[in-house]
């Protein structure tokens, strides 16, 4: 089948890093500079992605693979293949249309990206707050002291308060 296919389509013999040049009798020609083909049998090479501005090159373009970009310090990638760079904020903040804003009380963000999320509601799991939440950290849930003891002090109720001027019998 492979042999039959190659007889019908000589371009299928062109490996990655080349293209099937119609102008040269379907000879396999190497991709020109700043272009690549990642699969065989291609009739054109794709233009290499250029990492400019807020983007920086993470991996150079080669004849068989596209360049890969990431973001310059102070920014982070968004989208498939880092199609966008978004400004970092500090932990305890989120990015709004007006820039970085502190998380509202009761919410936190432990990363430099993303939105502020509500603190965990420990009581939903029947637990109590062991460590309070902050803008940067979620609460830590755990048992309340009552989970470790049924209570001992009920054995001895507090002594009744004496009225002034009365001595104990």
């Amino acid at each position: 089948f492979e042999r039959t296919r190659s007889l019908q389509d000589p371009c299928s013999n062109c490996p990655a890093g080349t293209f099937c040049d119609n102008n040269r009798n379907q000879i396999c020609s190497p991709c020109p500079p700043n272009s690549f083909s990642s699969a065989g049998g291609q009739r054109t090479c794709d233009i290499c992605r250029q990492c400019k501005g807020v983007f920086r090159t993470r991996k150079e373009c080669s004849s068989t693979s596209n360049a890969e970009c990431d973001c310059t310090p102070g920014f982070h990638c968004l989208g498939a293949g880092c199609s966008m760079c978004e400004q970092d904020c500090k932990q305890g903040q989120e990015l709004t249309k007006k820039g970085c804003k502190d998380c509202c009380f009761g919410t936190f963000n432990d990363q430099k990206r993303g939105i502020c999320r509500p603190w965990t509601n420990c009581s939903l799991d029947g637990k109590s707050v062991l460590v309070n939440g902050t803008k940067e950290r979620d609460v830590v849930c755990g048992p309340s002291p009552a989970d470790l003891s049924p209570g001992a002090s009920s054995v001895t109720p507090p002594a009744p308060a004496r009225e002034p001027g009365h001595s104990p019998q």
């Epitope: 002291p145 470790l148 003891s149 009920s154 109720p157």
Partner: antibody, heavy 112, light 112 residues
Framework: DVQPQQSGAELVRPGASVKLSCKAL????????MYWVRQTPVHGLEWIGA????????AYNQKFKGKATLTADKSSSTAYMELSSLTSEDSAVYYC?????WGQGTTLTVSA | DVVMTQTPLSLPVSLGDQASISCRSS???????????LHWYLQKPGQSPKLLIY???NRFSGVPDRFSGSGSGTDFTLKISRVEAEDLGVYFC?????????FGGGTKLEIK
């Protein structure tokens, strides 16, 4: 911080009394009992008693009745233990705890 | 008083080994409310005890999952699946079902 904060080391004379303090942190002091425990190389960990700051209720290990008196001040979230008629046998590290977290301990040395 | 008996007294291990500590009580630790108030603590030199496991088998916040507790009634076990250097110290079992609350004598986990 959530670890109870205890008063510093004490060096006292035999026959004297001492009052140790324990400040609760990170939870509602009046809702739960505070316990006192002592540790010695000979007897290991020994439970002295409990106080419920909300109700004022107390419970004592029979061994420490008359030796220890537990009180609490709700306004400062602080529990106290007074130890009286001290002897060298009372030299120990004394801990307060709500069982999840323990204070750092107060070292009591009774010596002439 | 409820007597808590821990075995062994000393447990020499190699790092990465499994360790198992037994705790037996002189009477059942099942409370009338159905809960079993048996807890495990680790005490490192110069520090206060730290809670590892509460109510037989519940890992406390931040305690690695290599620690597990099991048992019922009067017979309880603490297992450490792969001992790490930070696990070395003295392990205590403790019961808070019956007043006075009591503690085991401790098991020292040390390097072989």
């Amino acid at each position: 911080d959530v670890q109870p904060q205890q008063s510093g080391a004490e060096l006292v004379r035999p026959g004297a009394s001492v009052k140790l303090s324990c400040k609760a942190l990170g939870y509602t002091f009046t809702d739960y009992e505070m316990y006192w425990v002592r540790q010695t190389p000979v007897h290991g960990l020994e439970w002295i008693g409990a106080i419920h700051p909300g109700s004022g209720g107390t419970a004592y290990n029979q061994k420490f009745k008359g030796k220890a008196t537990l009180t609490a001040d709700k306004s400062s979230s602080t529990a106290y233990m007074e130890l009286s008629s001290l002897t060298s046998e009372d030299s120990a590290v004394y801990y307060c705890t709500e069982l999840r977290y323990w204070g750092q301990g107060t070292t009591l040395t009774v010596s002439a | 008083d409820v007597v808590m008996t821990q075995t062994p007294l000393s447990l020499p291990v190699s790092l990465g080994d499994q360790a198992s500590i037994s705790c037996r009580s002189s009477q059942s630790l099942v409370h009338s409310n159905g809960n079993t108030y048996l807890h495990w603590y680790l005490q490192k030199p110069g520090q206060s005890p730290k809670l590892l496991i509460y109510r037989v088998s519940n890992r406390f916040s931040g305690v690695p999952d290599r620690f597990s507790g099991s048992g019922s009634g009067t017979d309880f076990t603490l297992k450490i699946s792969r001992v790490e250097a930070e696990d070395l110290g003295v392990y205590f079992c403790s019961q808070s079902t019956h007043v006075p609350y009591t503690f085991g004598g401790g098991t020292k986990l040390e390097i072989k």
